[in-house]
């Protein structure tokens, strides 16, 4: 793999997802992502963020919630919830703008 460019100081985060290479990772910030796919139970993934910090500002929906933090292992004990199911006319978009 190509060498990754330096992005300034890195933070160590808890990593819990099918794609983690170990129990921790290093990134520009730590993340928790709670996702519910159609017909499945919500899954919570913990890891590192390096791109698109704007996702951290997205509001929770009934399908996804993103959480970001900036200190050592700050994502370890965070638990997220999804928004309650809304009627189609009330559904918020997942667009982060």
């Amino acid at each position: 793999d190509p060498v990754k460019p330096s992005r300034g100081p890195l933070v160590t985060c808890t990593c819990e997802s099918p794609h983690c290479r170990g129990p921790t990772c290093q990134g520009a910030w730590c993340t928790v992502v709670l996702v519910r796919e159609e017909g499945r139970h919500p899954q919570e993934h913990r890891g590192c963020g390096n791109l698109h910090r704007e996702l951290c500002r997205g509001r929770p929906t009934e399908f996804v919630n993103h959480y970001c933090c900036d200190s050592h292992l700050c994502n370890r004990n965070v638990s997220l919830v999804l928004e309650a199911t809304q009627t189609p006319s009330e559904q918020p978009g997942t667009d982060s703008q």
């Epitope: 990754k4 460019p5 794609h19 791109l51 982060s96």
Partner: antibody, heavy 118, light 108 residues
Framework: QVQLQESGPGLVKPSQTLSLTCTVS??????????WNWIRQHPGKGLEWIGY???????YYNPSLKSRVTISVDTSKNQFSLKLSSVTAADTAVYYC??????????WGQGTLVTVSS | EIVLTQSPGTLSLSPGERATLSCRAS???????LAWYQQKPGQAPRLLIY???SRATGIPDRFSGSGSGTDFTLTISRLEPEDFAVYYC?????????FGQGTRLEIK
């Protein structure tokens, strides 16, 4: 080896919705390291970013196209899709999908030409 | 939105010469997220440089990138016949992602 392949109609009528799918092979679309992008290129012109989707389904769109664009993901099929509504001749372009990582847009599809014409 | 302006629009050089392509941003860009791409007719863009100065896999060392803040440069130290193409700079990693308008490198 990661590969991306665009598919969809090459001809769309004005006012209709352009629909394209990008199938990813050789890697998982569900990896949190990657963002999945659509880019287009009008004939003889430069590159225009349309938007991205993350495996979680969160999206971000080019403000100039936001009102007409929807990008969705199907992790079970390792695919993501683009819908562009109310198309006109100005939407005639080669449409590319690409994977974004900290190392830039490191993998691209070969591109598919979509012509908007009646 | 960060606007990227590339110069010159067209650069005419001969094989063996040195090419210097410029990319100027309307506001400061993180050097970690500035990339360069090469595109040949009928092909998808190909990643050359990411993070301002890191070469992508398989890219020859005659390609190099530099810069910071608002001014970035792609240098091709000794042009080979296959290097004549269009080159784009891009800022990525935060949205909206933007590309420069391109520099066409043509054979003199």
């Amino acid at each position: 080896q990661v590969q991306l392949q665009e598919s969809g109609p090459g001809l769309v009528k004005p006012s209709q919705t352009l629909s394209l799918t990008c199938t990813v092979s050789g890697g998982s679309i569900s990896s949190g390291e990657y963002y999945w992008n659509w880019i287009r290129q009008h004939p003889g012109k430069g590159l225009e970013w349309i938007g991205y989707i993350y495996y979680s389904g969160s999206t971000y769109y080019n403000p100039s196209l936001k009102s007409r664009v929807t990008i969705s993901v199907d992790t079970s099929k390792n695919q993501f899709s683009l819908k562009l509504s109310s198309v006109t001749a100005a939407d005639t372009a080669v449409y590319y999908c690409a994977r974004e990582s900290v190392a830039g847009f490191d993998y691209w599809g070969q591109g598919t030409l979509v012509t908007v014409s009646s | 939105e960060i606007v990227l302006t590339q110069s010159p629009g067209t650069l005419s050089l001969s094989p063996g010469e040195r090419a210097t392509l410029s990319c100027r941003a309307s506001q400061s860009v993180s050097s970690s997220y500035l990339a360069w791409y090469q595109q040949k007719p009928g092909q998808a863009p190909r990643l050359l440089i990411y993070g301002t100065s890191s070469r992508a896999t398989g890219i020859p060392d005659r390609f190099s990138g530099s810069g910071s803040g608002t001014d970035f440069t792609l240098t091709i130290s000794r042009l080979e016949p296959e290097d004549f193409a269009v080159y784009y700079c891009q800022q990525y990693g935060s949205s909206p992602i933007t590309f420069g308008q391109g520099t066409r490198l043509e054979i003199k």
